[in-house]
């Protein structure tokens, strides 16, 4: 059965300066390959977080993604700014050179409210 990427919230609202959690769960870790979060779609989409590296200052994983059975790939964005508004996608890749996108969540739109 094909892996499914579940983003339960269609949208979230957050006040500027606050934090927000974007939820994402997978139904399987197979096939092996990385999970990444993007804002937007297509060629211009922006990488927001990758579970393969740890160089994303304002974004952290919510659960312990180093658990070998972990299926929760939710992220927390801190100190949200108006520039963070947009639709965020949790994307599962299959390993390869390069990795191949095989499944994306439905997206969660982030609205940033003035404080």
């Amino acid at each position: 059965t094909e892996v499914k990427v579940i983003q339960p919230e269609k949208s979230v609202s957050v006040a500027a300066g606050d934090s927000t959690v974007l939820n994402c769960t997978l139904t399987s870790l197979l096939p092996v390959g990385p999970i990444r979060w993007y804002r937007g779609v297509g060629q211009s989409r922006q990488l927001i977080y990758s579970f393969t590296t740890e160089h994303f200052p304002r974004v952290t994983n919510v659960s312990d993604a180093t658990k070998r059975s972990n299926l929760d790939f939710s992220i927390r964005i801190s100190n949200v700014t108006p520039e963070d508004a947009g639709t965020y996608y949790c994307v599962k890749f299959q390993r390869g050179s390069p990795d191949t996108e095989i499944q994306s969540g439905g997206g969660t739109e982030v609205y940033v409210l003035a404080k």
Epitope: L29, V32, P34, T66, R68, S69, R95
Partner: antibody, heavy 118, light 107 residues
């Protein structure tokens, strides 16, 4: 620089216990899963156990399940391996290793020798 | 179990390929580890199929396809003499496995 330093090895009798430690420095220890790997004299590498970054999940090879326990103390940047009911077959150099995101290894300690002999 | 040749040999400057088979493309990631003498600390030369740590020379490369992984050393040097172990992480069983090791001799 990433550094892993094992300690606690030595000579013990069959049936006895030993606790190995691995002191980590040069990286955010609490962000990484860790593993123990051993090498018996004249043999190859053998993975024994791995533990998640937060310490709540542990995994073992069948041959040590129930006898060995992997644990960690993130406040002390330390990894441990409690070994009980040791036998001569457990004689080996024991290495701690830092795991990559997909549970392979990127950094290794120098190892500590455990000898089980009567 | 992961299977690799017991030994390979090459002249300096030649290209060496060491294969590791027995994994499953769907569930297994591979790594390669160099050990220059028994009991000395292994050194990671490749992880995640093809990722080379920054301090490893570019002559080392890795690839994976189907049920096998390959370590390639392009322009092998005398200092590359060592035992090379492949390892796999199986995302189905959550277990790591090592191959028996391949002794590389540079003639």
């Amino acid at each position: 620089d990433v550094q892993l330093v094992e300690s606690g090895g030595g000579v013990v009798r069959p049936g006895e216990s030993l606790r190995l430690s691995c002191a980590a420095s040069g990286f955010t220890f609490s962000s990484y899963a860790m593993s123990w790997v051993r090498q018996a004299p004249g043999k190859g590498l053998e993975w024994l156990a791995g533990i998640s970054a937060g310490g709540s999940d542990a995994y073992y090879i069948d041959s040590v399940k129930g006898r060995f326990t992997i644990s960690r103390d993130n406040s002390k940047n330390s990894l441990y391996l409690q070994m009980n009911s040791l036998t001569a077959e457990d004689t080996a150099v024991y290495y701690c290793a830092r795991e990559t995101w997909n549970h392979l290894f990127d950094y290794w300690g120098l190892g500590t020798l455990v000898t089980v002999s009567s | 179990a992961l299977t690799q040749p017991a030994s390979v040999s090459a002249n300096p400057g030649e290209t060496v390929k060491i294969t590791c088979s027995g994994g499953d493309w769907y569930s297994t990631y591979y790594g390669w580890y160099q050990q220059k003498s028994p009991g000395s600390a292994p050194v990671t030369v490749i992880h995640s199929d093809d990722k080379r740590p920054s301090d490893i020379p570019s002559r080392f490369s890795g690839s994976a396809s189907g049920s096998a992984a390959t370590l390639t050393i392009t322009g092998v040097r005398v200092e590359d003499e060592a035992v090379y172990y492949c390892a796999g992480y199986d995302g189905r069983t959550y277990i790591n496995t090592f191959g028996a090791g391949t002794t590389l001799t540079v003639l």
